[in-house]
């Protein structure tokens, strides 16, 4: 009685259970009455990352420097190349097919999370008591200067974009 289902790492063809090819190898010939499955290693710059019955290996991803990409991890016969972005850039998608410049946080906003090769800068508005007066991909919101600790008084209130201005205490008081 021919099988209707096969074991793990096998596939059903012509009423027979054939072994799948291991990662890093492609299928040449299905198994037969006389032979095991015939598999061949993937070529240079090719890979297959699963037990498979593919007749062609996949090409390794190309990290195009014109798109701001560079190789993070070189591919093997069993794994694809992993691309990342040049310094100051990050991937536009999980697949990292192209890069864009890291976003800067405008004045009034500070960096909550510095960008990585795969994620953009995360900005947050400076809360009361903090400010940022620059456009930056690294600067956090800074706390207003504490005039009191310097034996000074606030002459000009701070905003989310400006620090407080301190001045000497009024001596007439």
């Amino acid at each position: 009685e021919p099988p209707t289902a096969c074991r793990e790492k096998q596939y059903l063809i012509n009423s027979q259970c054939c072994s799948l090819c291991q990662p890093g190898q492609k299928l040449v010939s299905d198994c037969t009455e006389f032979t095991e499955t015939e598999c061949l290693p993937c070529g240079e710059s090719e890979f297959l990352d699963t037990w498979n019955r593919e007749t062609h290996c996949h090409q390794h991803k190309y990290c195009d420097p014109n798109l701001g990409l560079r190789v993070q991890q070189k591919g093997t016969s069993e794994t694809d190349t992993i691309c990342t972005c040049e310094e100051g850039w990050h991937c536009t998608s999980e697949a990292c097919e192209s890069c864009v410049l890291h976003r800067s946080c405008s004045p009034g906003f500070g960096v909550k999370q510095i960008a990585t090769g795969v994620s953009d800068t995360i900005c947050e508005p400076c809360p009361v008591g903090f400010f940022s007066n620059v456009s930056s991909a690294f600067e956090k919101c800074h706390p207003w200067t504490s005039c009191e600790t310097k034996d000074l008084v606030v002459q000009q209130a701070g905003t989310n974009k400006t620090d407080v201005v301190c001045g000497p205490q009024d001596r007439l008081r």
Partner: antibody, heavy 113, light 112 residues
Framework: QVQLVESGGGLVKPGGSLRLSCAVS????????VYWIRQAPGKGLEWMGM???????DYSTSVKGRFTISKDNAKTSVYLQMSSLRAEDTAVYYC???????WGQGTLVTVSS | ELQLTQSPLSLPVTLGQPASISCRSS???????????LHWYLQRPGQSPRLLIY???NRFSGVPDRFSGSGSGTDFTLKISRVEAEDVGVYYC?????????FGGGTKLEIK
Amino acid sequence: QVQLVESGGGLVKPGGSLRLSCAVSGFSLSRYSVYWIRQAPGKGLEWMGMMWGGGSTDYSTSVKGRFTISKDNAKTSVYLQMSSLRAEDTAVYYCVRTDGDYWGQGTLVTVSS
Amino acid sequence: ELQLTQSPLSLPVTLGQPASISCRSSQSLASSSGNTYLHWYLQRPGQSPRLLIYKVSNRFSGVPDRFSGSGSGTDFTLKISRVEAEDVGVYYCSQSTHVPWTFGGGTKLEIK
């Protein structure tokens, strides 16, 4: 449909050479393996060797070094190049596909002076 | 090189009676994948061989169910439950587990 047709047999002197061809149709030689078998007059079957789909070859100990199997995927033919032939190489030579029961009709090789 | 030894060399049988042919291997025919590549062929007079049984016990398409194969490791048997006139010829066992592939010497079945 699947077909294998041998040709190239004939009379050859001891020490001579001969190339047998196995023309196939109905399947691709890059996806299927083919082997050669011979049968001397009134004798049993003897496996000569095979050409795998991937291009590698295997041979029987009796012909290794004297016989060479090759293929031309484009011309859809498998070849058996025989050299240093001996009287005991006289036989009907068959090419066979390695699945199912697909045999050629056979070609007779006679090695005699 | 692996040897396949068939017995008997000659097998006279009465029509309608059973027949049995043995094939012994000089080493195990179980492959690393668990398959056993032991096959049986029939060569009728003047014809090329025809596959009867593959991988020990699987009847090839179109082969009557009076033919059956059994065995494991190094010991294998071909049985014909009721011999018919068309079963006359030479039976060969063959293995494709180990390279080089090999054939048994053959068993000639004839009608008594």
